[in-house]
């Protein structure tokens, strides 16, 4: 089983404040009791689970960063979605801030790709066509709305 | 205060067995997920099984299928490794833990001081 | 099995400055804005400790002067100003595909 195989709920359906485990976990949106007697909701807005669980806590929302925009806010069942502003991306070897687009290409080369949140400018070379930067990361997984199942794995 | 105590280590030949069990407090064990990891000598850490809250659901890596049976007594808030079949490459200090659950099993969050068991002739 | 490549094996910092032990795992770990990785401080004659989960989530207890970053199959666990207390080996542990794994474990000692 992988996490690939567990889809979490978009927003949780509306439920009480506490409802009980199922077999010890909890449902995406909630996190449980200490005395693990029952599910409680996470707060809107500042804390979120994606996933069946038995955490003590919801984890806290991300807060986007200077230079970043938000592309959706946090809800009980998921995180806020950052992205960097135009003009700037987000390099997959240092994800951690935006760095701003080249302007433009070297000498000899040709533009073939625009800025993007994910990545710089792309520059081939005139004659070859052999690409300047690395290839451009991958947006990040899609979320889907189907609700998650408490999976585990199997003998 | 999580408490989780390790026993059932010691010295058995090759193709012996050995129970281990571990006493929880401090935590509602009923509602967790736990595992046994284990430490070979001077080596890393792998996960040897791992058993939901009513015992329902089990893994094992293929390293110890088979071989192993974990179980649990929540009415005793206690966890077991049943190990039959011993080989050398099972010399390790196997430690009980509360395994968090997060989609799947996730980290582990509790662990006790661990038990040498040592296979050897 | 993702396998977990931690490096450098070994790493001598000198009290007060920054430690940094980099976790690669041969394939993503990342779903749903989540990235499944752990890590572990083990000191002599214990067991590990959780410091943190999901990449960047400081367990209740451990010093804020550890944190951790990183996506997709690139993680860092930084100790931004080392302390004596902070020798001890260092895990990672993903959780996004069983079975679960650990990485081989990075040294840290005082320079």
């Known amino acids: 089983i992988t996490q690939q195989d567990l889809a979490p709920q978009q927003r949780a359906a509306p439920q009480q404040k506490r409802s009980s485990p199922s077999e010890g976990l909890c449902p995406p949106g909630h996190h449980i009791s200490e005395d693990g007697r029952d599910c409680i909701s996470c707060k809107y807005g500042q804390d979120y689970s994606t996933h069946w669980n038995d955490l003590l806590f919801c984890l806290r929302c991300t807060r986007c960063d200077s230079g970043e925009v938000e592309l959706s806010p946090c809800t009980t069942t998921r995180n806020t979605v950052c992205q960097c502003e135009e003009g700037t991306f987000r390099e997959e070897d240092s994800p951690e801030m935006c760095r701003k687009c080249r302007t433009g290409c070297p000498r000899g080369m040709v533009k073939v790709g625009d800025c993007t949140p994910w990545s710089d400018i792309e520059c081939v070379h005139k004659e070859s066509g052999t690409k300047h930067s690395g290839e451009v990361p991958a947006v990040e997984e899609t979320v889907t709305s189907s609700p998650g199942t408490p999976a585990s794995p199997c003998s | 205060e999580v408490q989780l105590v390790e026993s059932g280590g010691g010295l058995v030949q090759p193709g012996g067995s050995l129970r281990l069990s571990c006493a929880a407090s401090g935590l509602p064990f009923n509602s967790y997920y736990m595992s046994w990891v284990r430490q070979a000598p001077g080596k890393g850490l792998e996960l040897v099984a791992a058993?939901?809250?009513?015992?329902?659901?089990?893994h094992y890596p293929d390293t110890v299928k088979g071989r192993f049976t974990i179980s649990r007594d929540n009415a005793k808030n206690s966890l077991y490794l049943q190990m039959n079949s011993l080989r050398a490459e099972d010399t390790a200090v196997y430690y009980c833990?509360?395994?968090?659950?997060?989609?799947?099993?996730?980290?582990?969050?509790?662990w006790g001081q661990g038990t040498l068991v040592t296979v050897s002739s | 099995n993702i396998v977990l490549t931690q490096s450098p094996d070994s790493l001598a910092v000198s009290l007060g400055e920054r430690a940094t032990i980099n976790c690669r795992a041969s394939?993503?770990?990342?779903?749903?804005?989540?990235?499944?990785m752990h890590w572990y401080q083990q000191k002599p004659g214990q067991p590990p400790k959780l410091l943190i989960y999901?990449?960047?989530n400081l367990e209740s207890g451990v010093p804020d002067r550890f944190s951790g970053s990183g996506s997709r199959t690139d993680f860092t666990l930084t100790i931004s100003s080392l302390q004596a207390e902070d020798v001890a080996v260092y895990y990672c542990q993903q959780s996004y595909e069983d079975p679960l794994t650990f990485g081989g474990g990075t040294k840290v000692e005082i320079k």
């Open positions: 833990t509360r395994l968090t659950y997060y989609g799947n099993p996730a980290w582990f969050a509790y």
């Open positions: 394939e993503s770990v990342d779903i749903y804005g989540n990235s499944f």
């Open positions: 999901l990449s960047s």
């Open positions: 058993i939901n809250s009513n015992g329902g659901r089990i």
